[in-house]
């Protein structure tokens, strides 16, 4: 079976959520709060593949680990997989669900799961709390709107 | 183009309240973070807290008891609450936009409100 | 809480490179101190010039430029005009409060 078109060059990206909180990862889960002292160090970057015309693959340590939206029963979760960002293909059945749809509204920027619709990559309002899914991005209850910069 | 304008009481009696408003235009407090900030006569800056574009809050620790931050997008309003006034808080007091990148925060400023504490 | 620190004044002439510096108490300024200059003009005019260390705000003339030098945070004006006669302010961040340093009185005689 034919592997499918490759994606484009990987590119990294800082993110931090309008409360300003930035990622890290804690016990192989990503988490959002407000690093401090030495541990601003453990900031995750954001490693991006872009997909025309608005849709991306994401990824942390390099690319070496992504975000997918995996739906279990009732259950719909972001999961970080230990997969090669440059090795997904848009036109592969099975990489969809590490697809996002990115859509910016001035500064910011929100995410949504191509393969679960409705749902949107989110932090918490609290500080140090698993990013996630959320089908609710504007009931207030959790972040969905991003700050999403391009790493220097 | 970016606007904020602060409004204020003036003249507060020590120990009662004060409330300010900041009433921005050209962007939005879903998108912008806004500070408050302080500066007692002859003196230089003092930061007393944030508000987030997500609501989240951020006081300066030695002031937080008598804080309050809150803000209402629709009218694109932020407002600051400050209790137990004393002399010693008298002061022109900002409110400052915080950019959209990282960190970079007090880009835009208001003109200020003055505030005078004193019987 | 931190402490941070500038020059109370300093003195330049028309066309000279001048630095401002912004000390901090708990050690070296990083750039995870995300430092920010904001410059004062008469009649409470405050404008800010630099964000996150070294971002230059919209219409910021490109003579100011941020940076850290040894352990401190820099603002350094390259070619300096008499109309960047002012006071300016530093804010550093310490995870998620501000602190703003004394106020260095910039003279462009």
């Known amino acids: 079976r034919p592997s499918g078109r490759k994606s484009s060059k990987m590119q990294a990206f800082r993110i931090w959520d309008v409360n300003q909180k930035t990622f890290y990862l804690r016990n192989n889960q990503l988490v959002a709060g407000y690093l401090q002292g030495p541990n601003v160090n453990l900031e995750e970057k954001i490693d991006v593949v872009p997909i025309e015309p608005h849709a991306l693959f994401l990824g942390i340590h390099g690319g070496k680990m992504c975000l997918s939206c995996v739906k279990s029963g009732d259950e719909t979760r972001l999961q970080l997989e230990a997969v090669n960002i440059t090795d997904l293909s848009e036109n592969r059945k099975q990489d969809k669900r590490f697809a996002f749809i990115r859509s910016d509204s001035g500064p910011t920027t929100s995410f949504e799961s191509a393969a679960c619709p409705g749902w949107f990559l989110c932090t918490a309002m609290e500080a140090d709390q698993p990013v996630s899914l959320t089908n609710m991005p504007d009931e207030g209850v959790m972040v969905t709107k991003f700050y999403f910069q391009e790493d220097e | 183009q970016v606007q904020l304008k602060e409004s204020g009481p003036g003249l507060v009696a020590p120990s009662q309240s004060l409330s300010i408003t900041c009433t921005v235009s050209g962007f939005s407090l879903t998108s912008y973070g806004v500070h408050w900030v302080r500066q007692p006569p002859g003196k230089g800056l003092e930061w007393l807290g944030v508000?987030?574009?997500?609501?989240?809050?951020h006081y300066n620790s030695a002031l937080m008891s008598r804080l309050n931050i809150s803000k209402d997008n629709s009218q694109s309003q932020v407002f600051l609450k400050m209790n137990s006034l004393r002399t010693d808080d008298t002061a022109m007091y900002y409110c400052?936009?915080?950019?959209?990148?990282?960190?970079?925060?007090?880009?835009?400023w208001g003109q200020g409100t003055t505030l005078t504490v004193s019987s | 809480q931190a402490v941070v620190t500038q020059e109370s004044a300093l003195t330049t002439s028309p066309g000279e490179t001048v630095t401002l510096t912004c000390r901090s108490s708990?050690?070296?300024?990083?750039?995870?101190?995300?430092a920010n200059w904001v410059q004062e003009k008469p009649d409470h005019l405050f404008t800010g010039l630099i964000g996150?260390?070294?971002n230059r705000a919209p219409g910021v003339p490109a003579r100011f430029s941020g940076s850290l030098i040894g352990d401190k945070a820099a603002l350094t004006i390259t070619g300096a005009q008499t109309e960047d006669e002012a006071i300016y302010h530093c804010?550093?961040?310490?995870?998620?409060?501000?602190v703003f340093g004394g106020r260095t009185k910039l003279t462009v005689l």
């Open positions: 400052a936009r915080g950019g959209a990148l990282l960190r970079s925060h007090f880009d835009y």
């Open positions: 708990t050690g070296a300024v990083t750039t995870s101190n995300y």
């Open positions: 996150g260390t070294n």
């Open positions: 804010a550093l961040w310490y995870s998620n409060l501000w």
């Open positions: 508000i987030w574009a997500g609501g989240v809050t």
